[in-house]
C-alpha cells in the first residue's frame, strides 16, 4: 500500500467538535500523532492555514467523499491512506459524542487508529492492537501500541533511530581513513574541496594528495560546529552554509554580517527544519536542496523556488537516495553524492551513476 515518502508530515484540524474544548481536541490529536512518532522517524507538525498533508475533519452524513457517515454508533471515523488531495485525511463522525475519557467515544483512541490508516496501516487481526477494527476503550494514561502495531508501522517507516546520524561522542578528530567515515557536508570553494564533519573540516586542494584538518572555529569563529549542508556559487565568490533552520553566507572566505538567516527565506514550507545537502549547478544556475527523501530546486537568478517541487530524490536521480548526507558539483558534469561511507559519482547529463567510491576516496586512503 501507499506510504508517505517523507518524514516531515503536516496536519491541520479543519474544524472542531462542539463536544469538547478546542484545547482538548488539539491535545488529543497531538498526542495521537505522538504515539506514532515515538516509534518511527516521522515528525508531525500542526499548521493552521494552507494545505496540510493530513486534514482532520469532524462531519456528519454526506461530507465530501463517497463514504457518508451513518449517524450515532456504527462507523465512528475513517481515514484515507497516504497520498495527495484527500490522501491521509481523517474524518470523524460528528454524530458521535467525542470525549477525553471513557464516556461517549474517546477521541484520542479513535485518532490513534485513524492516523494509523493515514500513515498506511490496514486493520490488524490482533484484538490487542489499536489497528483492530472495532473500538474498545482502554485507559488512555497507560495506553501503549501493541507489538503488532509497532511491527506494522516500522515495516513501513523503520524505527526512530533510522536515518539519524549519531554525533561523534567525544568530538575528537575523526580518523580520515576510517572506512566507515561519513561527512556532514561537502562543497567546492574555488579550486578546493571542503569536507565538513562535526567541528572539523578537511581541505583538499584539487589534484593534490595532501589534505589538512582544521577546526571550523579557527577559520570562521562565528560559525557553529556540525554544518549540515553547503554549496558554492563560484562566479559570485559565495559559499552558503546550513545548520538546522539557519544559513550563513561566506563571501570571499569571509562571513557576511547580518547572518544567520532563516532557511525559510528561500521559500521552504514551515515543516522543513533542516537541509541535508545542497549543490549549485552553474550550467542551469539552479541550486538543488535535499531534505529527507525529497529535493527542491531554487532559481538563483530569480531568487525563488521553481514550481513543481519538492520531488522524490529516487525518482529523479537514478540510484541515489532515498536520503543523502552531502553533495558537491565538479568537472562541469558530475555531482558527487555522499551516503554514509559511500560516495557516488553521478553524471547529470547522462542522468546515471558512473562510479561508486568510498566517501574518503579523495584523501588517497
Amino acid at each position: 500500500g501507499p506510504v508517505w515518502r517523507k518524514h516531515y508530515i503536516t496536519y491541520r484540524i479543519n474544524n472542531y467538535t462542539p463536544d469538547m474544548n478546542r484545547e482538548d481536541v488539539d491535545y488529543a490529536i497531538r498526542k495521537a500523532f505522538q504515539v506514532w512518532s515515538n516509534v518511527t522517524p516521522l515528525k508531525f507538525s500542526k499548521i493552521n492555514t494552507g494545505m496540510a498533508d493530513i486534514l482532520v475533519v469532524f462531519a456528519r452524513g454526506a461530507h465530501g467523499d463517497f463514504h457518508a457517515f451513518d449517524g450515532k454508533g456504527g462507523i465512528l471515523a475513517h481515514a484515507f491512506g497516504p497520498g495527495s488531495g484527500i490522501g491521509g485525511d481523517a474524518h470523524f463522525d460528528e454524530d458521535e459524542f467525542w470525549t477525553t475519557h471513557s464516556g461517549g467515544t474517546n477521541l484520542f483512541l479513535t485518532a490513534v487508529h485513524e492516523i494509523g490508516h493515514s500513515l498506511g496501516l490496514g486493520h490488524s487481526s490482533d484484538p490487542k492492537a489499536v489497528m483492530f477494527p472495532t473500538y474498545k476503550y482502554v485507559d488512555i494514561n497507560t495506553f501503549r501500541l501493541s507489538a503488532d502495531d509497532i511491527r506494522g508501522i516500522q515495516s513501513l517507516y523503520g524505527d526512530p533511530k533510522e536515518n539519524q546520524r549519531l554525533p561523534n561522542p567525544d568530538n575528537s578528530e575523526p580518523a580520515l581513513c576510517d572506512p566507515n567515515l561519513s561527512f556532514d557536508a561537502v562543497t567546492t570553494v574555488g579550486n578546493k574541496i571542503f569536507f565538513f564533519k562535526d567541528r572539523f573540516f578537511w581541505l583538499k586542494v584539487s589534484e593534490r594528495p595532501k589534505t589538512s584538518v582544521n577546526l571550523i572555529s579557527s577559520l570562521w569563529p562565528t560559525l557553529p560546529s556540525g554544518i549540515e549542508a553547503a554549496y558554492e556559487i563560484e562566479a559570485r565568490n559565495q559559499v552558503f552554509l546550513f545548520k538546522d533552520d539557519k544559513y550563513w553566507l561566506i563571501s570571499n572566505l569571509r562571513p557576511e554580517p547580518n547572518y544567520p538567516k532563516s532557511i525559510h527565506s528561500f521559500g521552504f514550507p514551515n515543516f522543513v527544519k533542516k537541509i541535508d545537502a545542497a549543490v549549485f549547478n552553474p550550467r542551469f544556475y539552479r541550486t538543488y536542496f535535499f531534505v529527507d527523501n525529497q529535493y527542491w530546486r531554487y532559481d538563483e537568478r530569480r531568487q525563488m523556488m521553481d514550481p513543481g517541487y519538492p520531488k522524490l530524490i529516487t525518482k529523479n536521480f537514478q540510484g541515489i537516495g532515498p536520503k543523502i548526507d552531502a553533495v558537491f558539483y565538479s568537472k562541469n558534469k558530475y555531482y558527487y553524492f555522499f551516503q554514509g561511507s559511500n560516495q557516488f559519482e553521478y553524471d547529470f547529463l547522462l542522468q546515471r551513476i558512473t562510479k561508486t567510491l568510498k566517501s574518503n576516496s579523495w584523501f588517497g586512503c
Partner: antibody, heavy 122, light 103 residues
Framework: EVQLLESGGGLVQPGGSLRLSCAAS????????MHWVRQAPGKGLEWVSG????????FYADSIKGRFTISRDNSKNTLYLQMNSLRAEDTAVYYC???????????????WGRGTLVTVSS | DIQMTQSPSSLSASVGDRVTITCRAN??????LNWYQQKPGKAPELLIY???SLQSGVPSRFSGSGSGTDFTLTISSLQPEDFATYYC?????FGQGTKLEIK
C-alpha cells in the same frame, strides 16, 4: 500506459438488459476503486456507480439503484456493469474510470476509457 | 445531500483572454473538488484535483483555487486547444458543465 477499454454497448429495447465490460491494462488493477460515469447525448457527466478493490463496498446513483449492478474480476482485470430494466433515459455513452485511490474512494478519476454507447429505444 | 452549482453554463472568449469558471457547493467540501476538461467526442481528462493541485502534464496556465463551498478554475491565457467543456466534480456529483466557445 494505462488503458481502459469499454465494450458491450449497443441498441436495446426498453425493459431490456445489457452487460458492459471494461478491460484494464497498464496498471495493477486490484488495489483501486473503479467507477462507471455516463453522459447522455448533448448533456453533462453523471456518476453511475463505484466499486471497492475487493468487489465491495459498492455505491450507486439513486437514478439506477436496484436496476444496475457493478462488479469486477480482479483475475481478469475487468470491471462490469450489469444493466437491467433499461429505460430511454439510460441512453448515454458509458465511461469506465479509475479512481486514484484504494481502501476508501476519493472520487478522483485519473484515467477514463473512451466510452461505449448504450441506446435504449423501441 | 451535497449539490454542485457551476457557472456560467457557457461563455465566449478569445485566444489570450483570462477566463474564470466557478463552482459552488451547498455545504463545505473542504478542498475535495476536481476539475475536468472534455473535448467533443472524447473522454474527460483530469485538470485539477484537491481544488488547486495541477495534474501532471497539464499546462501551468490552468489553476484552481478555493476551499469550503466556493471554487474557481482559471485559465490565465486562453489557447486554441482550450475551447472545450469544463466540469467540476466532488465524489459522485458533477457540476452541469461550462462550455467555453470561441468569440
Amino acid at each position: 500506459e494505462v488503458q481502459l477499454l469499454e465494450s458491450g454497448g449497443g441498441l436495446v429495447q426498453p425493459g431490456g438488459s445489457l452487460r458492459l465490460s471494461c478491460a484494464a491494462s497498464g496498471f495493477t488493477f486490484s488495489p483501486y476503486w473503479m467507477h462507471w460515469v455516463r453522459q447522455a447525448p448533448g448533456k453533462g457527466l453523471e456518476w453511475v456507480s463505484g466499486i471497492g478493490p475487493s468487489g465491495g463496498p459498492t455505491f450507486y446513483a439513486d437514478s439506477i439503484k436496484g436496476r444496475f449492478t457493478i462488479s469486477r474480476d480482479n483475475s481478469k482485470n475487468t470491471l462490469y456493469l450489469q444493466m437491467n430494466s433499461l429505460r430511454a433515459e439510460d441512453t448515454a455513452v458509458y465511461y469506465c474510470a479509475k479512481d486514484i485511490r484504494g481502501a476508501y474512494s476519493s472520487g478522483l478519476f485519473d484515467y477514463w476509457g473512451r466510452g461505449t454507447l448504450v441506446t435504449v429505444s423501441s | 445531500d451535497i449539490q454542485m452549482t457551476q457557472s456560467p453554463s457557457s461563455l465566449s472568449a478569445s485566444v489570450g483572454d483570462r477566463v474564470t469558471i466557478t463552482c459552488r457547493a451547498n455545504q463545505s467540501i473542504y478542498t475535495y473538488l476536481n476539475w475536468y476538461q472534455q473535448k467533443p467526442g472524447k473522454a474527460p481528462e483530469l485538470l485539477i484535483y484537491a481544488a488547486s493541485s495541477l495534474q501532471s502534464g497539464v499546462p501551468s496556465r490552468f489553476s484552481g483555487s478555493g476551499s469550503g463551498t466556493d471554487f474557481t478554475l482559471t485559465i490565465s491565457s486562453l489557447q486554441p486547444e482550450d475551447f472545450a467543456t469544463y466540469y467540476c466534480q466532488q465524489a459522485g456529483i458533477f457540476g452541469q458543465g461550462t462550455k467555453l466557445e470561441i468569440k
